[in-house]
Interface confidence: low
Amino acid sequence: DAHKSEVAHRFKDLGEENFKALVLIAFAQYLQQCPFEDHVKLVNEVTEFAKTCVADESAENCDKSLHTLFGDKLCTVATLRETYGEMADCCAKQEPERNECFLQHKDDNPNLPRLVRPEVDVMCTAFHDNEETFLKKYLYEIARRHPYFYAPELLFFAKRYKAAFTECCQAADKAACLLPKLDELRDEGKASSAKQRLKCASLQKFGERAFKAWAVARLSQRFPKAEFAEVSKLVTDLTKVHTECCHGDLLECADDRADLAKYICENQDSISSKLKECCEKPLLEKSHCIAEVENDEMPADLPSLAADFVESKDVCKNYAEAKDVFLGMFLYEYARRHPDYSVVLLLRLAKTYETTLEKCCAAADPHECYAKVFDEFKPLVEEPQNLIKQNCELFEQLGEYKFQNALLVRYTKKVPQVSTPTLVEVSRNLGKVGSKCCKHPEAKRMPCAEDYLSVVLNQLCVLHEKTPVSDRVTKCCTESLVNRRPCFSALEVDETYVPKEFNAETFTFHADICTLSEKERQIKKQTALVELVKHKPKATKEQLKAVMDDFAAFVEKCCKADDKETCFAEEGKKLVAASQAALGL
């Protein structure tokens, strides 16, 4: 139903608090370098304007689209040209090209300082001094660093952030109460951001059809008792929500997500028996809970898939009549029977089935041609099963840090042109698959591991897209969304790579390493490991292990020394010389 004023409609639906928060997120995700105060000023101006439209929908400019209103507001920023360079050219365009232009300039790796958390007393004072500003700063800082963060979910994070401070700033031991909560929010936030980034990449790079296929598979696993028509309706609505959020339409996205949660809860009897608890929660918690809800039990006595999709004489007729509907039904039926498969595996199977039908339905004897299609699935299923088995064994043998190091070496050899910080970040995240998924029983390992790896490899893809340096990465990232992981797995050592010149500065360390947290110290060591492999890509595991062990001993020794800086200078030179000799540099 059309509204005279879109901005008034969204303001009334969402309420002032959510409206202001979502506009702040939207602006911070577009203009990531703008100071906090500038964004607050813009948000206040938009909010005041929205209120005039609520009072009179016919008032001047109230009939304009949200993109027009928000784009006009962003284009009033005086320093646009000097801060953002060519992004300022977007302002010369008309909608919808202007918004597309802003979207294209979103930066997945903005040059912003690392956020450093102050002491608990300082934060609690800031929280009590001005709670509203404190929470706005949280939204602003997260949104500008994660320009694709799922906005309605960020509201949920902010609610938990506020709750943590409200509770812990009154506690006897503030730090013991608050710090674990903030760590949990940080880690969950990074994971949430990365998962949403994959959804947006799926929509933007591979199109709506690819996203819908993903959604059919995932929702069919989650709601195996729901009928196909119900799953299709949910997929359509979910696609609209994510298309809006990925497109910067955050008010519409949040509004439609709330409607979808309402629909799911009103129809839970025909969707899933697991939704009851979620549906008793307030809106933000409810939506989050539904998104994370466990898979419902599979209906008993589901018939064999072969009857409808292989043995039936109507396979080609049904396929020809409505290809995507028939493939969607195949995907739905396969996914609801296989919660033990990853979504990407289910999509590979559906693609294989589609390719077979395309070929066979044009053949002289279609049935004879596609009769053995399910046999083609076997190697596709076994490949991730074997890979996960091998890597979980390696993880259990090495532990997380050394498992990450093994992946660092493996991936640096595959794509040595990629920047060291990206290789370290991505390999560390790939390595976390061990502690995240290997503890699960067999039936849950593959969906946990392979779908998580898809999220992490997408991080590599979006970071690499900003500064492309490797044709192999581009190829794996762009050819097929569902085959990204197998594509990277299949890469061997890059024989064309010319080793990096040795630079002693790269391996010069100082006493500041002694005061770093364990995590930061690991990152320093892993950075050195990547650089070693870039200098000596043919180095064996044994050689690298020996050098890394020497390095660890060197750091430990110098951190215990009285004159740490002198120790690092003198022993460091010896270590560099010994490492060069050991690796033949």
């Epitope: 100071p35 906090f36 105060e37 300082p113 690392r114 956020l115 450093v116 958390r117 102050p118 002491e119 300082v122 934060m123 004072t125 800031a126 001094d129 001005n130 404190f134 700063k137 949280y138 800082e141």
Partner: nanobody, 124 residues
Framework: DVQLVESGGGVVQPGGSLRLSCAAS????????MGWFRQAPGKEREFVSA????????YYADSVKGRFTISRDNSKNTVYLQMNSLRPEDTALYYC?????????????????WGQGTLVTVSS
């Protein structure tokens, strides 16, 4: 209100050292987080280092770690920045800043009071 006055800037050769000082007046110095920021010609202002009220925590930008050291003397209402192994890219106007309430140390908008700056030039 807090007034901040920086000193100690100057011209130095690459590899050389300088010590910047920032004297505060007009507030209870020991209740403020103190930070150093810098702005090179034609560039944006960037975080350099910060120190908590009682010197328990110190923070540094990656580009200065291991070379710069921040310290404070609450009895003298002064914060210092010892800069060693200076490089040409350290050339900038260095600002001292004070923050009473802060959510993040590295964000310049968190700092309520600023000095006028002291110029550091690293050149051979």
């Amino acid at each position: 209100d807090v007034q901040l006055v920086e000193s100690g800037g100057g011209v130095v050769q690459p590899g050389g050292s300088l010590r910047l000082s920032c004297a505060a007046s007009g507030g209870t110095f020991s209740t403020y987080v103190m930070g150093w920021f810098r702005q090179a010609p034609g560039k944006e202002r960037e975080f350099v280092s910060a120190i908590s009220q009682n010197s328990i925590h110190t923070y540094y930008a990656d580009s200065v770690k291991g070379r710069f050291t921040i310290s404070r003397d609450n009895s003298k209402n002064t914060v210092y920045l010892q800069m060693n192994s200076l490089r040409p890219e350290d050339t900038a106007l260095y600002y001292c800043a004070a923050s009473r309430f802060t959510s993040w140390y590295t964000a310049d908008y968190e700092y309520d009071y600023w000095g006028q700056g002291t110029l550091v030039t690293v050149s051979s």
